[in-house]
Amino acid sequence: AWELTILHTNDVHSRLEQTSEDSSKCVNASRCMGGVARLFTKVQQIRRAEPNVLLLDAGDQYQGTIWFTVYKGAEVAHFMNALRYDAMALGNHEFDNGVEGLIEPLLKEAKFPILSANIKAKGPLASQISGLYLPYKVLPVGDEVVGIVGYTSKETPFLSNPGTNLVFEDEITALQPEVDKLKTLNVNKIIALGHSGFEMDKLIAQKVRGVDVVVGGHSNTFLYTGNPPSKEVPAGKYPFIVTSDDGRKVPVVQAYAFGKYLGYLKIEFDERGNVISSHGNPILLNSSIPEDPSIKADINKWRIKLDNYSTQELGKTIVYLDGSSQSCRFRECNMGNLICDAMINNNLRHTDEMFWNHVSMCILNGGGIRSPIDERNNGTITWENLAAVLPFGGTFDLVQLKGSTLKKAFEHSVHRYGQSTGEFLQVGGIHVVYDLSRKPGDRVVKLDVLCTKCRVPSYDPLKMDEVYKVILPNFLANGGDGFQMIKDELLRHDSGDQDINVVSTYISKMKVIYPAVEGRIKFSTGSH
């Protein structure tokens, strides 16, 4: 028998520095977690102790903090090279800055293979990107070889900016021939490494003949066997065992997100490359693990540029950006409108001629807007200013909801109106009218939404049984501020870009902004 140790990360999302327990900015260092310096300590410790070790990343290193905003992926290549990753799969967020923003900083600089079998380049891009990412890679591990096949969510064109010259094929259809090829080349130990979410990971384990292990990402799935060491609640045991259609037991793993854990899976193979046993658990990278001094010093060196960036002007406002709780928790506020407009703008994807865009709606809890921005400072808006407005380090995500769920959400928005509570919704692509004289749960008297399948966008009444795409903060997607109906009833959830980054990009693009209060949210006469 031959034993392989798979160390894995996924959805690190630019958390190069250690973070607090909830993966936001580290405040009290003695209680902070993760970060590449701490990760390196643990990886090196395992490499020294065990003979056959692979360090893999299942995508979405890009996007999530000011590190990505400033360094645009160069930081990913640099620190992943320093940690000596063995392979990485492309995630959807790797395309956030377009194909060029993937090729130049990451694909050309990475000293490890970057994989995806279901992304096919066409047109002029095919020759430019040829060999920079691969469908599979065979790696020598000790005295054996291990094949790694990559895959990426086929929803990427709706979630990021891969352009028109990359085709995202069905994962299973694309993986099978690559695995078959590896088998003909006498590779008998094969890992599928990819970024399509836990449900697809399980399907790959079930359907792709010849895959021995699946290492996934995208859904931020936390798996654990035994008592979990932090706040994350396990979605199942680690590894999660899937019985394949041909009767094999295939371990599937994922390691939550944000570099908080290092996935640790030990696999035992027989001489023919069959999995005999698999066991392990994610390792919580808490402060009991010291940060590696040389990586930490490098992080501190790279940090300097970030501090300079946060005080630079992104753009100007010529109006007061009212982000006060007195406004945003009671009525339409222009800061809410600005943020929602930025959220929609960040999700412009012309993927179908029938649709002007795939999504037109935004909702945003007023309690998530934490500060106004005064225009009487020469109109200057900096990253620092935006960090005061959006201090929680969240993301603006894409969900699919039924109209009936949205109606419930808007009822919840005003179910206890007047108490300055955070659930009051700011909106974009939505016209809502409330009648506060009615009883809670029956206060939404009009709810019109902007059409997407139209050449001239207009507002139509919400249909209860129709499925709508909505951009919202991850906080709401996870049921925050009492929006349990969103969490319970959402049909799909894809994590998006860092909230501050979305707004800062929009302001930089617009150069000068002047958001108004324009009647998105109204109260029917006599009730307010």
Epitope: V138, P140, D143, V145, N186
Partner: antibody
């Protein structure tokens, strides 16, 4: 059918350099690891170097490490061996060999090219 | 570094006889052992890989066995074309070594 044809052999003085090539045909060159193996006149076989299918890994015998360099051009279906700081003991027939199973199965061998290192 | 030894250095047999060639590694090489045949003026030819698997086109009279440090190549009934030099070869940590060879000649 698989064919491996070595070229570039000849006489070289000690300390000088020589470059060998191996033209491959009849199979998908970019799928296979490739080796150089040598055989001194009247002696046994000695492994020299291995290069991975995509040139991402190289391995060398201690006797040539730091002096010889294996490389490949998959677009030209060609394997190379750059030999520097040649010594008399490098005199041998050099074989280009296909690796069909990750070092376990050196299944096709060229006919070899003779390198003579002599002053 | 793993050293390979082969015995005997020379094996003198007649056609039709059984040939047993031995190969020993200085430390375990798992199953990563191959056997090659070389005739004068020719390139070597792969006979056996992974200790016991016959290569494509190799007659059934050739068989390999063993694991760890001790390996055997057996030719059940020598044919005239089998008289040649036989080399064993191991790989360990991507370093390859050949044995010194056993010459099988006609008695």
């Amino acid at each position: 059918q698989v064919q491996l044809v070595e070229s570039g052999g000849g006489v070289a003085q000690p300390g000088r350099s020589l470059s060998l090539s191996c033209a491959a045909s009849g199979f998908t060159f970019s799928d296979y690891g490739m080796h150089w193996v040598r055989q001194a006149p009247g002696k046994g076989l000695e492994w020299v170097a291995l290069i991975w299918y995509d040139a991402s890994f190289e391995y060398y015998a201690d006797s040539v490490k730091g002096r010889f360099s294996i490389s490949r051009d998959n677009s030209k279906n060609t394997l190379y061996l750059q030999m520097n700081s040649l010594r008399a003991e490098d005199t041998a027939v050099y074989y280009c060999v296909r690796d069909a199973q990750w070092g376990s199965r050196l299944d096709y061998w060229g006919q070899g090219t003779l390198v003579t290192v002599s002053s | 570094k793993i050293v390979m030894t082969q015995s005997p250095a020379t094996l003198s047999l007649s056609p039709g006889e059984r040939a047993t060639l031995s190969c020993r590694a200085s430390q375990s090489v798992s199953r990563y052992l191959a056997w090659y045949q070389q005739k004068p003026g020719q390139a070597p030819r792969l006979l056996i890989y992974d200790a016991s698997n016959r290569a494509t086109g190799i007659p059934a009279r050739f068989s390999g066995s063993g694991s760890g440090t001790d390996f055997t190549l057996t030719i059940s009934s020598l044919e005239p074309e089998d008289f040649a030099v036989y080399y064993c070869q191991q790989r360990s940590n991507w370093i390859f070594t050949f044995g010194p060879g056993t010459k099988v000649d006609i008695k």
